[in-house]
């Protein structure tokens, strides 16, 4: 028996369902009574789901997994993982034993889009050219960690005096805060781009300083 899985990682959004594809080629006359199927976390050997002795033994992993029972006899051993969490990320191995055996591993990459950044300025009044200001760009509830880029109004990257911190909340999602310290010119636009490297999703925020008032 030969087990096949997708070579590319499966990307799943937090709180959505994901399918980890696994298939085998049943011989003519194959019946489910012959099938032994085990899904396991590759790095820890934790049992996730199993089908043995002709029946689905159910989820051993927080009751959020399911097989496709009607498709098993056709060789579809895929696993459905419901309400994906950050902690589900990793490698899963599909083990199949009929008359002989095989196994293959598939990676699950979890992702969550970042919110549109909010921009704050400190100080936020009595600003004059030559003043040092702190611009903070904050974006929330994303995964995995973001890449943050700053540019001026001409699109020139600003790399000096940037401090970025990322903190995971109790669900494992990241809140990103990036601080740019800059000396004000006569006027100018400062934009922050928060990129999710897995989703290739960019979230933009900008602040324009033209004397008073400020434009966000």
């Amino acid at each position: 028996v030969e087990v096949q899985v997708s070579e590319d990682p499966v990307v799943a959004l937090v709180d959505t369902d994901a399918t980890l594809r696994c298939s085998f080629s049943p011989e003519p006359g194959f019946s489910l009574a012959q099938l032994n199927l085990i899904w396991q976390l590759t790095d820890t050997k934790q049992l996730v789901h199993s089908f043995t002795e002709g029946r689905d033994q159910g989820s051993a992993y927080s009751n959020r997994t399911a097989l496709f029972p009607d498709l098993l006899v056709q060789g579809n051993a895929s696993l459905r993982l419901q309400r994906v969490r950050v902690t589900d990320e990793g490698s899963y191995t599909c083990f199949v034993s009929i008359q002989d055996f095989d196994s293959a591993a598939v990676s699950l990459q979890v992702a969550a889009p970042y919110s549109k950044p909010s921009m704050t300025l400190e100080p936020n009044k009595d600003l004059r050219p030559g003043n040092m200001v702190t611009i903070t760009c904050s974006s929330y509830q994303g995964y995995p960690e973001a890449e943050v880029f700053w540019k001026d109004g001409q699109g020139v990257p600003l790399t000096g005096n940037v401090t970025t911190s990322q903190m995971a909340n109790e669900r494992g999602l990241f809140d990103v805060h990036s601080v740019l310290r800059v000396v004000l010119g006569a006027n100018g636009t400062y934009s922050c781009l928060v990129r999710n490297p897995v989703l290739q999703q960019d979230a933009h925020g900008s602040v324009t300083i033209t004397g008073q008032p400020l434009t966000f």
Partner: antibody
Framework: QVQLVESGAEVKKPGASVKLSCKAS????????MHWVRQAPGQRLEWMGE????????NYNEKFKSRVTITVDKSASTAYMELSSLRSEDTAVYYC????????????????WGQGTLVTVSS | DIQMTQSPSSVSASVGDRVTISCRAS??????LAWYQQKPGKAPRLLIY???SLDSGVPSRFSASGSGTDFTLTISSLQPEDFATYYC?????????FGQGTRLEIK
């Protein structure tokens, strides 16, 4: 070639602890799960637990879970097994075993064995 | 835990004989079964994995079969170096468990 060299024989009193070592060579230490299997005189083999040296993850036989601790020192390519609250029934030969066939089976195949360490528990 | 039961517990045979050892699992284990040979004072040696696959270096006189709950190990023509104790092991579930062993003695 793969070699697993275990520490020497131990004699312990009931209630004491013993810590055995297993020095691995001939392969990349972090790439094979390491197991501990024991065999009391005239008895069947008994799996105690395992460790993934790459990430430190352990799985234990529930029978021993409260008494056994398996660790590794990656820099020394050495695995350790500590068994506490020893009793006379723990008298056995203790083997460390490396499993290079991890993807083949859901649990383990015991391919490379150490020479064994005799632990005698006696008052 | 999955119980593994071997039969017979011991068997006497002569060089050149054909010998069969059985192993039964208390629940279905597919083909995730291994066989080991152990000689006195030595560590066990893996002979068979996945119920029927010979490990490298194992002579072809050893063969094995089975799936589900019933498995057999066969030595087609006993050689002097085959007299030892043989163990089966299930590799599907934790805790990993072994049979009680079958001692193969010279008649």
């Amino acid at each position: 070639q793969v070699q697993l060299v275990e520490s020497g024989a131990e004699v312990k009193k009931p209630g004491a602890s013993v810590k055995l070592s297993c020095k691995a060579s001939g392969y990349t230490f972090s790439s094979y799960w390491m197991h501990w299997v024991r065999q009391a005189p005239g008895q069947r083999l008994e799996w105690m637990g395992e460790i993934n040296p790459g990430n430190g993850h352990t799985n234990y036989n529930e029978k021993f879970k409260s008494r056994v601790t398996i660790t590794v020192d990656k820099s020394a390519s050495t695995a350790y097994m500590e068994l506490s609250s020893l009793r006379s029934e723990d008298t056995a030969v203790y083997y460390c075993v490396a499993d290079p066939r991890r993807p083949k089976v859901p649990t383990a195949l015991f391919v490379y064995w150490g020479q064994g360490t005799l632990v005698t528990v006696s008052s | 835990d999955i119980q593994m039961t071997q039969s017979p517990s011991s068997v006497s045979a002569s060089v050149g004989d054909r010998v069969t050892i059985s192993c039964r699992a208390s629940q279905g284990i597919g083909t995730w079964l291994a066989w080991y040979q152990q000689k006195p004072g030595k560590a066990p040696r893996l002979l068979i994995y996945a119920a029927s696959s010979l490990d490298s270096g194992v002579p072809s006189r050893f063969s094995a079969s089975g799936s589900g709950t019933d498995f057999t190990l066969t030595i087609s023509s006993l050689q002097p170096e085959d007299f030892a104790t043989y163990y089966c092991q299930q590799a599907i579930n934790f805790p990993i468990t072994f049979g009680q062993g079958t001692r193969l003695e010279i008649k």
